[in-house]
């Protein structure tokens, strides 16, 4: 397995643990969601990654100005996404690069599922019965 | 001891079986146990479900219903070492859509 597909809870460096919550969020389109990570903030900075599918590699999350915001208050880092859309679906990871070892540690990930119908066509299709 | 990443969620229709894997790299006879955390309920300890079934420590829940929803976490322990815990998989139980009153084949509808 690739290294990013596995993890352990090492007894090693101070930033070898990063906790993420919640594991799963299902919300209707347009709502605001928040996900959180708790870590030893003295060990290094936190960034956010995103992937659409389970078996993809996570990519650096491009923060959409005015809609997505990352904040950090000591050990607690938060990602806030306002007005969620279907294209926000996926798994979000927080990641910390250790200052002293340059090793990278990831949280477990938060899966976001945006609920509702994505198109008018889908909505019609569900309600249509042939005459 | 390494734990491999597991799916963040699993969607199963009402009445179907749910299969949870606990992939890890232990070559020894590791002890795999399964636990459930109710979503949004941060009580400790989580509900103990029992041991895994095969060398992969699979958990199978038969005939799933709404009450089975939650986060399923496996723990792997080698000997007296402290356990490693998976990230957990959230089980989503889907109600199958109701069959339409006019549940007929396309050919019949178009006659």
């Amino acid at each position: 397995a690739r290294s990013e597909d596995r993890y352990r809870n090492p007894k090693g460096s101070a930033c070898s643990r990063i906790w993420q919550s919640p594991r799963f969020i299902a919300r209707k389109r347009g709502f605001t969601v928040k996900m959180h990570c708790y870590m030893n903030s003295a060990s290094g900075n936190v960034s956010w990654l995103w992937k659409q599918e389970m078996d993809e590699n996570p990519q650096q999350l491009k923060l959409e100005k005015g809609r997505m915001e990352e904040s950090q208050n000591e050990s607690l880092a938060t990602l806030t996404i306002q007005g969620i859309r279907f294209e926000d679906n996926g798994i979000y990871f927080c990641q910390q690069k250790c200052n002293n070892t340059s090793e990278v540690y990831q949280g477990c990930g938060t899966e976001l599922r945006v609920m509702g119908f994505s198109t008018l066509a889908q909505l019609k299709q569900r309600n249509t019965l042939k005459d | 001891l390494w734990m491999h990443k597991v799916p963040a969620s699993l969607m199963v229709s009402l009445g179907e079986d749910a299969h949870f894997q606990c992939p890890h790299n232990s070559s020894n006879n590791a002890n795999v146990t399964w636990w459930r955390v109710l979503h949004g309920n941060y009580t400790w300890p989580p509900e103990f479900l029992g041991p895994g079934e095969d060398p992969n420590g699979t958990l199978i829940i038969q005939n799933v219903n709404k009450s089975h929803g939650g986060i399923y976490v496996c723990r792997v322990q080698e000997g007296n070492e402290s356990y490693q815990q998976s990230c957990g998989t959230y089980l989503r139980v889907r109600q199958p859509p109701p069959r339409p009153f006019l549940d007929m084949g396309e050919g019949t509808k178009n006659r």
């Epitope: 906790w19 919640p22 708790y38 607690l76 | 955390v37 309920n41 941060y42 400790w44 300890p45």
Partner: nanobody
């Protein structure tokens, strides 16, 4: 509003032990992380130890093997057992609680001084 009540601070000799306790006026169902941070004079506040709702723990390198964090799950108590104390452990120790929704609460702090 959530109140955190710390107790157990004091003056200790190097090599001694001390136990800090913090109780939160909040339902234990509403706690994701319980932690202790500390702030030494002229330094930034830093994480000492934390325990989450899964019972997993994290420690700062400087206290590993000497400090132990634990909690009473029925109550909303978190304790920090500090053994083999060193002069560099001298600081104000703060209790920290985080809810699943990311609300963060802090105690007033309790002074720990390690000196011969």
């Amino acid at each position: 509003d959530v109140q955190l009540q710390e107790s157990g601070g004091g003056l200790m000799q190097p090599g001694g032990s001390l136990s800090l306790t913090c109780t939160a006026s909040i339902s234990s169902l509403s706690i994701w992380v319980r932690a202790w941070h500390r702030q030494a004079p002229g330094k930034q506040r830093e994480l000492v130890a934390a325990i989450n709702s899964d019972g997993q723990t994290m420690y700062a390198d400087s206290v590993k093997g000497r400090f132990t964090i634990s909690r009473d799950s029925a109550k909303t108590t978190v304790s920090l057992q500090m053994d083999s104390l060193k002069p560099e452990d001298t600081a104000v120790y703060y209790c920290n609680v985080v809810t699943p929704k990311g609300q963060q609460y802090w105690g007033q702090g309790t002074q720990v001084t390690v000196s011969s």
